[in-house]
């Protein structure tokens, strides 16, 4: 028996920043569950991890230097990405492992979605305009 | 209160096998990874690998992957791990010991140890 | 595999001196540095985990500090019962590996 997961198949980092949800075909309310973000084809970088319980305070964090926040609905999690770098565009899976009560659950490999990073584009004004016309 | 003990002291001879379990209670089993950590005598600590209960899913340290083997049985909240081939230079003091599932980098509770001797 | 080199590999200290022993990773670990004690004859002990982070039931001489490659931990004032071995181990990345450790003994 395997969790269901839907994620939008494309989102653009205008601002370096992005908000990506993770929506399950179960509900995480009082369940002990690891939610985790994996980034590229073969999933081997592991973003983000959100760790909840029913007892506990959401914990989220990332061993890998991504700077990241979650957010729990009641069959959702929602990753916030930020400080991204161009270079980070790739395509990242949303898992989810569900520990307690027994049985352990996982999750279909999603399709994954597409994240964009865009880089900052600031539009420079001239140090020095020419003379302005008459 | 939380628990890891484990089997008793072994002595094998070279070419043999040996198989250390730990028994694990007081916390729920498929929550936490289990680990096993060796000590040859007078040195350091070595990571052998590592098995989650809940998926037995396993992580193994390159040197021991094609002599070691973790398993679990769940239905007892034991772990066990199986060295073969045994050499001398194996014989070390073998410690299980637990990392969170969801909140993985430490080892908070360990076994008190297996001691096992490899000698002709 | 990322190496971890503990300084110094043993010292000689006094009841109530400060002692500090340094790690070292090969790459950076970020905040992923956990530091144990062992004692002769018995498994190690968790003291600090994510470098600084006390763990429970371990007295407040006990200190970590560090991120990246370079970790630090510190007893502000050795008792007899610290005599021991110490150990770091990075949490970051598979496999998890240990420093060579650092024995410290009565002066």
């Known amino acids: 028996n395997k969790i269901l997961v839907k994620q939008s198949p494309m989102l653009v980092a205008y601002d370096n920043a992005v908000n990506l949800s993770c929506k399950y075909s179960y509900n995480l309310f009082s369940r002990e569950f690891r939610a985790s973000l994996h980034k590229g084809l073969d999933s081997a970088v592991e973003v983000c991890v959100v760790y909840g319980n029913y007892s506990q305070q959401l914990q989220v964090y990332s061993k890998t230097g991504f700077n990241c926040d979650g957010k729990l609905g009641n069959e959702s999690v929602t990753f916030y990405l930020q400080n991204l770098y161009v270079n980070q565009t790739d395509i990242y899976f949303c898992k989810i492992e569900v520990m307690y009560p027994p049985p352990y659950l996982d999750n279909e490999k999603s399709n994954g979605t597409i994240i964009h990073v865009k880089g900052k584009h600031l539009c420079p004004s001239p140090l020095f305009p020419g003379p302005s016309k008459p | 209160q939380v628990q890891l003990v484990q089997s008793g002291a072994e002595v094998k001879k070279p070419g043999a096998s040996v198989k250390v379990s730990c028994k694990a209670s007081?916390?729920?089993?498929?929550?936490?990874?289990i680990h096993w950590v060796r000590q040859a005598p007078g040195q350091g600590l070595e990571w052998i690998g590592c098995?989650?209960?809940?998926?037995?899913?396993?992580n193994y340290n390159e040197k021991f992957k094609d002599r070691a083997t973790l398993t679990v049985d769940t239905s007892i909240s034991t772990a066990y791990m199986e060295l073969s081939r045994l050499r001398s230079d194996d014989t070390a003091v073998y410690f299980c010991t637990r990392s969170h599932y969801g909140l993985d980098w430490n080892f908070d509770v360990w076994g008190q140890g297996t001691t096992v001797t490899v000698s002709s | 595999d990322i190496q971890m080199t503990q300084s110094p590999s043993s010292l000689s200290a006094s009841v109530g001196d400060r002692v500090t022993i340094t790690c070292h990773a090969c790459?950076?670990?970020?905040?992923?540095l956990n530091w144990y004690q062992q004692k002769p004859g018995k498994a190690p002990k968790l003291l600090i985990y994510?470098?600084?982070n006390l763990h429970t039931g371990v007295p407040s001489r006990f200190s970590g500090s560090g991120s990246g490659t370079d970790f630090t931990l510190t007893i502000s004032s050795l008792q007899p019962e610290d005599f021991a071995t110490y150990y770091c181990?990075?949490?970051?990345?598979?496999?998890?590996?240990f420093g060579g450790g650092t024995k410290v003994e009565i002066k």
């Open positions: 098995i989650y209960p809940g998926n037995v899913n396993t």
């Open positions: 007081g916390y729920t089993f498929t929550s936490y990874y």
């Open positions: 790459q950076n670990i970020y905040v992923w």
């Open positions: 994510k470098a600084s």
């Open positions: 181990q990075q949490g970051q990345t598979y496999p998890y590996t």
